[in-house]
């Protein structure tokens, strides 16, 4: 269930997709990836206020218990709901090859 | 990939399964759930230091970018990797029914 998509904290403050530009060096990939030399990493960043984009029943429970016991139970967290695949050109023992990674770039986000 | 299960922050400090006892009132369920009257909610709580239980490539990227840009990119977050189903006895318009929820109790945890 994609509960409330309205962010009560103000525009852009709640859980959503962000793009962060990163070099191979930033990612620690320079020794095994040849291309791309820079990655536009899409990731999920932002707050998860009550019922905002609650992924499932567990997220709703977490919201309730966080309200009751904030020192014990953390608020739900903004994480990928799905991913976009991406191809990397990489060095291997046998030479250069293509590898597609299905879990590299966030496609959309929810709170859990 | 379940990277490192050794917690560098000390025993029990990193992402793992916790059990939190909650009443129907705590959960806001008193008006529609009859049983159980108390739920042992299993949830994922704890820190996600570098590569600890990294769920996938995205989590590894997030760790690297958090190290570089801690104010922009949050650390990976401890969330359920899978769930245990749970049955609730609930009130309906037509009486009482059983309903199994597949996404209510965390079964195990990872960092993403």
């Amino acid at each position: 269930a994609r509960n409330g998509d309205h962010c009560p904290l103000g525009p852009g403050r709640c859980c959503r997709l962000h793009t962060v530009r990163a070099s191979l060096e930033d990612l620690g990939w320079a020794d095994w990836v040849l291309s791309p030399r820079e990655v536009q990493v899409t990731m999920c960043i932002g707050a998860c206020p009550s019922q905002f984009r609650a992924a499932n029943m567990h997220a709703q429970i977490k919201t309730s218990l966080h309200r009751l016991k904030p020192d014990t139970v953390p608020a739900p967290c903004c994480v990928p709901a799905s991913y976009n695949p991406m191809v990397l050109i990489q060095k291997t023992d046998t030479g250069v090859s293509l590898q597609t990674y299905d879990d590299l770039l966030a496609k959309d986000c929810h709170c859990i | 990939a379940r990277n490192g299960d050794h917690c560098p922050l000390g025993p029990g400090r990193c992402c793992r399964l916790h059990t939190v006892r909650a009443s129907l009132e705590d959960l806001g369920w008193a008006d529609w759930v009859l049983s159980p009257r108390e739920v042992q909610v299993t949830m994922c709580i704890g820190a996600c230091p570098s590569q600890f239980r990294a769920a996938n490539m995205h989590a590894q990227i997030k760790t690297s970018l958090h190290r570089l840009k801690p104010d922009t990119v949050p650390a990976p977050c401890c969330v359920p990797a899978s769930y245990n189903p749970m049955v609730l006895i609930q009130k309906t318009d037509t009486g009482v029914s059983l309903q199994t929820y597949d996404d209510l109790l965390a079964k195990d945890c990872h960092c993403i």
């Epitope: 040849l34 291309s35 791309p36 976009n84 695949p85 991406m86 191809v87 990397l88 050109i89 250069v96 293509l98 597609t100 770039l105 | -």
Partner: antibody
């Protein structure tokens, strides 16, 4: 296993529009960094890059031919299409499509011969 | 556009000989690929990004260079190496290929 196969009319007359199809399998144009490129080769001559179409629908054309080229794709059916308008005998060549990963023609089709006469 | 000039246009080599094919760019490029095309077949990549051997390519092939000058070396020519060899740049659009070097085996 990645495979690509070009199909075209074989023969057509000057001034007509050449329509080529590249049907591929083993990869998806939904994958970031993935594209399909077209290259041609007149008999006994070298390779000439024509155009690329990318996962995000960006298109790049050889500037010398840009006004005559049109690229499109059908991602769900794993097909890419190239049209070349107003052909003449200089367009006689074997036309290849190739899988492009970022900057690399990684896999090529067998090519289809097109004769303008 | 960046023009790539390959030399020689035709090279004849004996089995076991070491040979070097060159590719000169009209302006500086960051990297160069090399493709091999045997008669009647489609091209396949040999060298990726100047010096990286593609998967499955024999180690007798190697690449080097920078700026405007790149080369492909075959340390010990074998009969199966008879083919056309093309350099390719993608540093700027339009992507371009060199005119090719035909390698014949004596």
């Amino acid at each position: 296993q990645v495979t690509l196969k070009e199909s075209g009319p074989g023969i057509l007359q000057p001034s007509q529009t050449l329509s080529l199809t590249c049907s591929f399998s083993g990869f998806s144009l939904n994958t970031h960094g993935m594209g399909v490129g077209w290259i041609r080769q007149p008999s006994g001559k070298g390779l000439e890059w024509l155009a690329n179409i990318w996962w995000n629908d960006d298109k790049y054309y050889n500037s010398a031919l840009k006004s005559r080229l049109t690229l499109s794709k059908d991602t769900s059916n794993n097909q890419v299409f190239l049209k070349i308008s107003s052909v003449d005998t200089a367009d006689t060549a074997t036309y290849f499509c190739a899988q492009v990963a970022w900057d690399w023609f990684a896999y090529w089709g067998q090519g289809t011969l097109v004769t303008i006469s | 556009q960046i023009v790539l000039t390959q030399s020689p246009a035709i090279m004849s080599a004996s089995l076991g000989e070491e040979i070097t094919l060159t590719c000169s760019a009209s302006s500086s490029v960051r990297y160069m690929h090399w493709y091999q095309q045997k008669s009647g077949t489609s091209p396949k990549v040999l060298i990726y990004s100047t010096s990286n051997l593609a998967s499955g390519v024999p180690s007798r092939f190697s690449g080097s260079g920078s700026g405007t000058f790149y080369s492909l070396t075959i340390s010990s020519v074998e009969a199966e190496d008879a083919a056309d060899y093309y350099c390719h740049q993608w540093s700027s659009y339009p992507w371009t290929f060199g005119g090719g070097t035909k390698l014949e085996i004596k």
